[in-house]
Interface confidence: low
């Protein structure tokens, strides 16, 4: 018998993956878990191997499918359980009936680019990754600069309200190192949460003109 | 065989409660969710909400104030009350159950149970 | 929520004929299902899915559309499908129903 508490919490990214962490105090060691997943209504099913994250938290992916097809609804719900292997059988060590799009994170937002940049300015763009067309512009993003001297954790957060995949980023320092990250979120669910951080984007702003006020 | 067995049903007082159960057999209510629909005599049907396989649930709106669904997962049994019945509460009450292949509809359906709401 | 609407309310059509019922939903759904009710009886599913037949279906029922408009036949009416037919849509909570079409035999 296992004691302590369990946590089992999944997120899926609107598309074809669902993405889970267990975590158990007086916690399994060399036992083989694995995460199961049941819709109520759809013929698949699918299973994952939990792998450790930490001393006492374990991770996996379920992969659905190709990683755009849409394999899940809002009126779905899949059965969640979590699958400790105990000789020869398997025990049930937790369980949730899991809306999709009650707990949602997206795939971080990819192929930041600089679209221009200036001496106090610079325009980046991104695009979203594997996020459902039920969305249509029901998104927000957060966005956040790093400045020499700074880490991530300073950086102020700018929000956008609407889906919008680019920003002007305003009274920059010329000649300098920036780094920009943004990350996205759906309007819709009780439990949905951001996205994770995109990869930092480096650019540098241009160069004050000679003999010219900065 | 997939089965399901409302009992319950009968008359109300106008104000009281109802409790109904739905038996089922040939499939573990552990495994799928279990639905309620109602037909009022000569009327369409119209869903009042569901119990899921892990023992969650979904309600309609109209109905969430004076609806408990729940389970027995021992005894294999979906039980629904309703309070603060009315005489528009008259009606068949049904329990359903989806089948097994991809967003195929209520494909089992109980032989339904009679509630009258009458003084 | 999502209002269906079938359209005719009921209709009577001789044994051989085809028979068509529409259903419009108030916006569009994803998932639609047509059912059977006979009198005294609990609902039968014949559709689902919008196009597939249920197990055990004869192959004179079939469904067609998307979006907000929908479509149920039967090729050859029989005596056996005097009934009331209600379509249903599982895109968004509530899960509701069309009012339903009579048929009868002329």
């Known amino acids: 018998a296992v004691n302590g508490t369990s946590r089992f919490t999944c997120f899926y990214n609107s598309r074809a993956n669902i993405s889970c962490v267990w975590s158990q105090d007086g916690a399994l060691q060399d036992t083989s878990c694995q995460v199961h997943a049941w819709p109520d209504r759809r013929r698949w099913n699918q299973t994952c191997e939990l792998l450790p994250v930490s001393q006492a938290s374990w991770a996996c992916n379920l992969i659905l499918g190709t990683p755009d097809s849409q394999k899940l609804t809002a009126v779905d719900i899949v059965t969640l359980r979590v699958m400790c292997r105990e000789g020869v059988r398997w025990r049930m060590m937790a369980i949730q009936d899991f809306k999709p799009f009650e707990n949602l994170r997206l795939m971080a937002p990819i192929s930041l680019q600089v679209v221009h940049v200036e001496t106090h300015r610079c325009n980046i763009s991104w695009k979203i990754s594997q996020a459902s067309h039920y969305f249509e512009r029901h998104l927000e993003f957060e966005a956040r600069t790093l400045s020499p001297g700074h880490t991530w954790e300073e950086a102020p957060l700018m929000t956008l309200k609407q889906k919008q995949e680019w920003i002007c980023l305003e009274t920059l320092t010329p000649d300098t190192q920036y780094e920009f990250q943004v990350r996205v979120k759906p309007l819709q669910g009780e439990f949905t949460t951001w996205s994770p951080w995109s990869q930092p984007l480096a650019f540098r702003t241009k160069p004050a003109a000679l003999g010219k006020d900065t | 065989e997939v089965q399901l067995l409302e009992s319950g049903g009968g008359l109300v007082q106008p104000g009281g409660s109802l409790r109904l159960s739905c038996a089922a057999s040939?499939?573990?209510?552990?495994?799928?969710?279990v639905h309620w629909i109602r037909q009022a005599p000569g009327k369409g049907l119209e869903w009042l909400g569901v119990?899921?396989?892990?023992?969650?649930?979904d309600y309609n709106a109209a109905f969430i104030s004076r609806l408990t669904i729940s389970k027995d997962n021992s005894k294999n049994t979906v039980y629904f009350q309703m309070n603060s019945l009315r005489a528009e509460d008259t009606a068949v009450y049904y329990c359903?159950?989806?089948?097994?292949?991809?967003?195929?509809?209520?494909?089992?359906w109980g032989q339904g149970t009679l509630v009258t709401v009458s003084s | 929520d999502i209002q269906m609407t079938q359209s005719p309310s009921s209709l009577s059509a001789s044994v051989g004929d085809r028979v068509t019922i529409t259903c419009q939903a108030s916006?569009?759904?994803?998932?639609l299902y047509w059912y059977q009710q006979r009198p005294g009886k609990a609902p039968r599913l014949l559709i689902y899915?919008?196009?597939n037949l249920a197990s055990g279906v004869p192959s004179r029922f079939s469904g067609s559309g998307s979006g907000t408009s929908y479509t149920f036949t039967i090729s050859s009416l029989q005596p056996e499908d005097i009934a009331t037919y209600y379509c249903?849509?599982?895109?968004?909570?509530?899960?509701?129903f069309g009012q339903g079409t009579k048929v009868e035999i002329k």
């Open positions: 040939g499939f573990s209510v552990t495994s799928y969710g």
């Open positions: 899915d919008t196009s």
């Open positions: 916006q569009s759904v994803s998932f």
């Open positions: 249903q849509q599982w895109s968004t909570y509530p899960l509701t």
């Open positions: 359903a159950r989806a089948g097994d292949a991809n967003y195929d509809g209520f494909a089992y």
């Open positions: 119990i899921w396989s892990g023992g969650s649930t």
